[in-house]
C-alpha cells in the first residue's frame, strides 16, 4: 500500500537499518526510497525539546510486515518509502536549505557570487555530493561568499548543524543538469586500476554499470565476467574512484570489462532498472519466499509486487510436476545485489522491476517505430504536440515538443503576429487533426518565451518555450522527450526522424495524420555549401537527403527532429527553415537544441 503523507510527532519503533543525516523529512523519504532495504523511516526535526545532536537524523528502517509500532514523539516525523508507490520517483533535489551547514569532506573551497553558482559548481564537479555556501552576511569576513564542495561515502551529510547566514544544497547531477561529459562505452578486456570503494556481484557489465551509476562514490567500474580465470572473482563488480575522476591507468585483461558511471547523463538512459533475464544462472541471497510460478516472467512479476523482494531465481518445473509450475525464489540482500552468482544449475534469474519507476520520464520505452510508410501511429511520437491559434479562426499553427510537465519547446518564428498567449491552444496525444473538436481538451498557454536574440529563422536563435497553464499528466500518448546532454556534443546521431502535420510539398495543405520521415544529419560544412547566401552557425543543425524527396515543410515548424541514441529519444533539433521543401541539395535547417540547453534550463527553472 502506498502511503505518501508524513506522520508528524510520530516515531517508528525498531527495525533500524542505518542512520543518515538529511536536511528535511521529505529528503529522508527519498533516501529511504533509494536505499535497497528501507521501507519506513523516522526523521528528527530541529526542536528545543530534542538534543541538537539528534536534529536532522534520518533513521532508515525495515520490517517483515512492512510496518512498525508507532510511538508519539515531539519533533519526530515518520513515513514510508515510495517503493510501495507506483508514481514516478526522482532523486533530484533542487531545494536550498537556509542556515544549515551540511557536513562532509570539504575538498574544494572557492569564491562564488551566489548559492546558485555554488550549486552549479557542485553539479559540474565529478566528486561533489552537496555544498555549503557562506552568504555575504556571514559574520566572518574571510569566509563570505565561500563555496565549499563536499562529498561523503554515502552521498548524504555526516552531520547537519544550524549555522546562521549559510545555505546548503545538493548536486543536481540527478536532475540531469550536469555539464560533465558522459562516457557510455563499455571497454572490453580492460581493467581500470584505481581505488575500489565497494564491490558487489552482478550478472553482466551493464548491471554493474547501473549499480555504479546509482552508487554515490562510484565514478567508474571493472567487471569480471563468468569466464574470468579466477573463480572467486567471477561476476565481481568493482566500484572505483580516483582523484581526477578518470582512471589513472588501464590494464588489458581477457574476460574483464570496464566502464563509467552515468551519473552525469542519468536522464539519457534508464539506469536503475535491470530488466533482463539471466538463463542458467542462480542468484544467491536471503530467501524471502518460495512461490509456485508458471514462468520466469511470472516470477519477476511476483518479485516486483513483493515490496521487499530485490531479485529472484526461478527453477522451471520438472515435467508433469506441480501443474507445470516452477519454483520462484524471492530474495533480498543488504545491498540489493546477489551475495553470489552461480552458473550451470538451470535457474533463470532477474531483478525486481519496481526500480523502473525511478527512471526519468523521458527515458520511458515508447512504442516501437513503424518501419516504412509516412503516417505515424498513435503513441509513436508522444512528445509531439500540435499548437493551434484561435485567431481569426482555429487552425494548426506549428508543431512543438513536450520537454517537461509544463513546458513545450518550439520555434520562435511560429509567433510572428501572435499578440497574446491567450489565442494559443496546445493539443497533446493527437494523431489526426480531425480528432480536435470543440470539446477536445487542450492546454492553455500562460507565457511565450522567445529567445531574446531571435530576429528571423535564417539568422538563428529560432527557439521558444511555451509555459502551459496546467501541468501535463504523462501517459503513453503524451510524455516528454529527453534534451540532449551537453556532454554528448560528440555524439553522431544516425537514427533521426522529423515529424509534423505540415505540407507534403511546397503548395499543399496541412495533413490530417501526423507524418514522419527518417532523415540523415548533414555536417555544417556540407550544409554551408548548400546555403552560400546564409551563415550556418554551430547553433544550427542540418538534415536531409542529397537527392531531396524527404524533408520538413510548412506547418512542421517548431516540431521535433528526434534522434534515437542508446535506445533513448533525444530532441536534437527544432524544425526551423530551409529553401523550399525536400529540394535536391537543400537540407532542412533546424535549431541545434544542445546549444540552448542552458537557456532552456534557465527559463524553465526560473522561480
Amino acid at each position: 500500500e502506498c502511503v505518501t503523507q508524513l506522520l508528524k510527532d510520530t516515531c517508528f519503533e525498531g527495525g533500524d537499518i542505518t542512520t543518515v543525516f538529511t536536511p528535511s523529512a521529505k529528503y529522508c523519504q527519498v533516501v529511504c526510497t533509494y536505499h535497497p532495504r528501507c521501507l519506513l523511516f523516522t526523521f528528527t526535526a530541529e526542536s528545543p525539546s530534542e538534543d541538537p545532536t539528534r536534529w536532522f537524523t534520518c533513521v532508515l528502517k525495515d520490517s517483515v510486515t512492512e510496518t512498525l509500532p508507532r510511538v508519539n514523539r515531539t519533533a519526530a516525523i515518520s513515513g514510508y518509502s515510495f517503493k510501495q508507490c507506483s508514481h514516478q520517483i526522482s532523486a533530484c533535489n533542487k531545494d536550498i536549505y537556509v542556515d544549515l551547514d551540511m557536513k562532509g569532506i570539504n575538498y574544494n573551497s572557492s569564491v562564488a557570487k551566489s548559492a546558485q553558482e555554488c550549486q552549479e559548481r557542485c553539479t559540474d564537479d565529478v566528486h561533489c555530493h552537496f555544498f555549503t555556501y557562506a552568504t555575504r552576511q556571514f559574520p566572518s569576513l574571510e569566509h563570505r561568499n565561500i563555496c565549499l564542495l563536499k562529498h561523503t561515502q554515502t552521498g548524504t551529510p555526516t552531520r547537519i548543524t544550524k549555522l546562521d547566514k549559510v545555505v546548503s544544497g545538493f548536486s543536481l547531477k540527478s536532475c540531469a543538469l550536469s555539464n560533465l561529459a558522459c562516457i557510455r562505452d563499455i571497454f572490453p578486456n580492460t581493467v581500470f586500476a584505481d581505488s575500489n570503494i565497494d564491490s558487489v556481484m552482478a550478472p553482466d557489465a551493464f548491471v554493474c554499470g547501473r549499480i555504479c551509476t546509482h552508487h554515490p562514490g562510484c565514478l567508474f567500474f571493472t567487471f569480471f565476467s563468468q569466464e574470468w580465470p579466477k573463480e572467486s572473482q567471477r561476476n565481481l563488480c568493482l566500484l572505483k574512484t580516483s582523484e581526477s575522476g578518470l582512471p589513472s591507468t588501464r590494464i588489458k585483461k581477457s574476460k574483464a570489462l570496464s566502464g563509467f558511471s552515468l551519473q552525469s547523463c542519468r536522464h539519457s538512459i534508464p539506469v536503475f532498472c535491470h530488466s533482463s533475464f539471466y538463463h542458467d544462472t542462480d542468484f544467491l541471497g536471503e530467501e524471502l519466499d518460495i512461490v509456485a510460478a508458471k514462468s520466469h516472467e511470472a516470477c519477476q512479476k511476483l518479485c516486483t509486487n513483493a515490496v521487499r523482494c530485490q531479485f529472484f531465481t526461478y527453477t522451471p518445473a520438472q515435467a508433469s510436476c506441480n501443474e507445470g509450475k516452477g519454483k520462484c525464489y524471492l530474495k533480498l540482500s543488504s545491498n540489493g545485489s546477489p551475495t553470489k552468482i552461480l552458473h550451470g544449475r538451470g535457474g533463470i534469474s532477474g531483478y525486481t522491476l519496481r526500480l523502473c519507476k525511478m527512471d526519468n520520464e523521458c527515458t520511458t520505452k515508447i512504442k516501437p517505430r513503424i518501419v516504412g510508410g509516412t503516417a505515424s501511429v498513435r503513441g509513436e511520437w508522444p512528445w509531439q504536440v500540435t499548437l493551434h491559434t484561435t485567431s481569426p479562426t482555429q487552425r494548426h499553427l506549428c508543431g512543438g515538443s513536450i520537454i517537461g510537465n509544463q513546458w513545450i519547446l518550439t520555434a520562435a518564428h511560429c509567433f510572428y503576429g501572435v499578440e497574446s498567449p491567450k489565442i494559443l491552444r496546445v493539443y497533446s496525444g493527437i494523431l489526426n487533426q480531425s480528432e480536435i473538436k470543440e470539446d477536445t481538451s487542450f492546454f492553455g498557454v500562460q507565457e511565450i518565451i522567445i529567445h531574446d536574440q531571435y530576429k528571423m529563422a535564417e539568422s538563428g536563435y529560432d527557439i521558444a518555450l511555451l509555459k502551459l497553464e496546467t501541468t501535463v499528466n504523462y501517459t503513453d500518448s503524451q510524455r516528454p522527450i529527453c534534451l540532449p546532454s551537453k556532454g554528448d556534443r560528440n555524439v553522431i546521431y544516425t537514427d533521426c526522424w522529423v515529424t509534423g502535420w505540415g505540407y507534403r510539398k511546397l503548395r499543399d495543405k496541412i495533413q490530417n495524420t501526423l507524418q514522419k520521415a527518417k532523415i540523415p544529419l548533414v555536417t555544417n560544412e556540407e550544409c554551408q555549401k548548400r546555403y552560400r547566401g546564409h551563415k550556418i552557425t554551430h547553433k544550427m543543425i542540418c538534415a536531409g537527403y542529397r537527392e531531396g524527396g524527404k524533408d520538413a515543410c510548412k506547418g512542421d515548424s517548431g516540431g521535433p527532429l528526434s534522434c534515437k541514441h542508446n535506445e533513448v529519444w533525444h530532441l536534437v533539433g527544432i524544425t526551423s527553415w530551409g529553401e523550399g521543401c525536400a529540394q535536391r541539395e537543400r537540407p532542412g535547417v533546424y535549431t541545434n537544441v544542445v546549444e540552448y540547453v542552458d537557456w532552456i534550463l534557465e527559463k524553465t527553472q526560473a522561480v
Partner: antibody
Framework: QVQLQESGPGLVKPSQTLSLTCTVS??????????WSWIRQHPGKGLEWIGS???????YYNPSLKSRVTISVDTSKNQFSLKLSSVTAADTAVYYC?????????????????WGQGTTVTVSS | DIQMTQSPSSVSASVGDRVTITCRAS??????LAWYQQKPGKAPKLLIY???SLQSGVPSRFSGSGSGTDFTLTISSLQPEDFATYYC?????????FGGGTKVEIK
C-alpha cells in the same frame, strides 16, 4: 580504407607549444573500437608512445610527458589533436598519429594497425 | 612502467635465412604484445598482435610466439623486402611501451 594525415608546423620555437592535428579519412573516428594515438621517434632512435584518446574523450598519457601533453578529439571534423607545451630541443622528432584497435568486433584484435606518414617537428630558435 | 628489452639490437642475415628476434618484458604481460616493421623514412607497420595473431595482409613467413614475459618474432625465410627495423610493443598496461628495436641488415 582508413587513412591518417598529420598536419602542423614543422618548426617550433623553444618554450612554445607544439600543436599537431591528425585527420582521419575513409572511416569515422566515432567508434568505441579504437583509441587514437600519438607516437614520436627521435632521430635515429626508437618509438615513444605519447598518449591515446577515445572518441568519448577518455585519454591516457605517458607519465614522462603528462604534465605537458593534451590530446583532444573533434568528432565533427573527424580529427584528433596533440598539444605539447614548453618544448625544448629534446622534443625534436618525427610525430606519428595512429589508430589503436581495441577489441574490434570481439575478436580480440589489437595493435596500431593504421599510421599516418609522420611529420617532422624541429624545435629551434 | 614496463620495460621491453629486444635482442639482438641488430642482426645480419641473407635472403632465405630464418631470423629470430626476442623481446622480454620486465613483468608479465599475458599475450598483450604486438610486433611492428619499420623501413627508413616510413611509418611502422603492424605485423603481429596478441603475441601470435598475424595481421591481415602480412605474409605467413612472419610468426609470433610467447606469453608472460618472453616473446619471439620469427621470419621463416627472409625476403629482400624484410630488411628493416622491428619493434615489439606491450599494450598490457598504460603507458604503452616499445622495445628498442632490432635492425635486420643484409649480410
Amino acid at each position: 580504407q582508413v587513412q591518417l594525415q598529420e598536419s602542423g608546423p614543422g618548426l617550433v620555437k623553444p618554450s612554445q607549444t607544439l600543436s599537431l592535428t591528425c585527420t582521419v579519412s575513409g572511416g569515422s573516428i566515432y567508434s568505441g573500437a579504437y583509441y587514437w594515438s600519438w607516437i614520436r621517434q627521435h632521430p635515429g632512435k626508437g618509438l615513444e608512445w605519447i598518449g591515446s584518446i577515445h572518441y568519448s574523450g577518455l585519454t591516457y598519457y605517458n607519465p614522462s610527458l603528462k604534465s605537458r601533453v593534451t590530446i583532444s578529439v573533434d568528432t565533427s571534423k573527424n580529427q584528433f589533436s596533440l598539444k605539447l607545451s614548453s618544448v625544448t630541443a629534446a622534443d625534436t622528432a618525427v610525430y606519428y598519429c595512429a589508430r589503436d584497435v581495441d577489441d574490434s568486433s570481439g575478436d580480440e584484435h589489437y595493435g596500431m594497425d593504421v599510421w599516418g606518414q609522420g611529420t617532422t617537428v624541429t624545435v629551434s630558435s | 612502467d614496463i620495460q621491453m628489452t629486444q635482442s639482438p639490437s641488430s642482426v645480419s642475415a641473407s635472403v632465405g635465412d630464418r631470423v629470430t628476434i626476442t623481446c622480454r618484458a620486465s613483468q608479465g604481460i599475458d599475450s598483450w604484445l604486438a610486433w611492428y616493421q619499420q623501413k627508413p623514412g616510413k611509418a611502422p607497420k603492424l605485423l603481429i598482435y596478441a603475441a601470435s595473431s598475424l595481421q591481415s595482409g602480412v605474409p605467413s613467413r612472419f610468426s609470433g610466439s610467447g606469453s608472460g614475459t618472453d616473446f619471439t618474432l620469427t621470419i621463416s625465410s627472409l625476403q629482400p623486402e624484410d630488411f628493416a627495423t622491428y619493434y615489439c610493443q606491450q599494450y598490457h598496461i598504460v603507458p604503452i611501451t616499445f622495445g628498442g628495436g632490432t635492425k635486420v641488415e643484409i649480410k
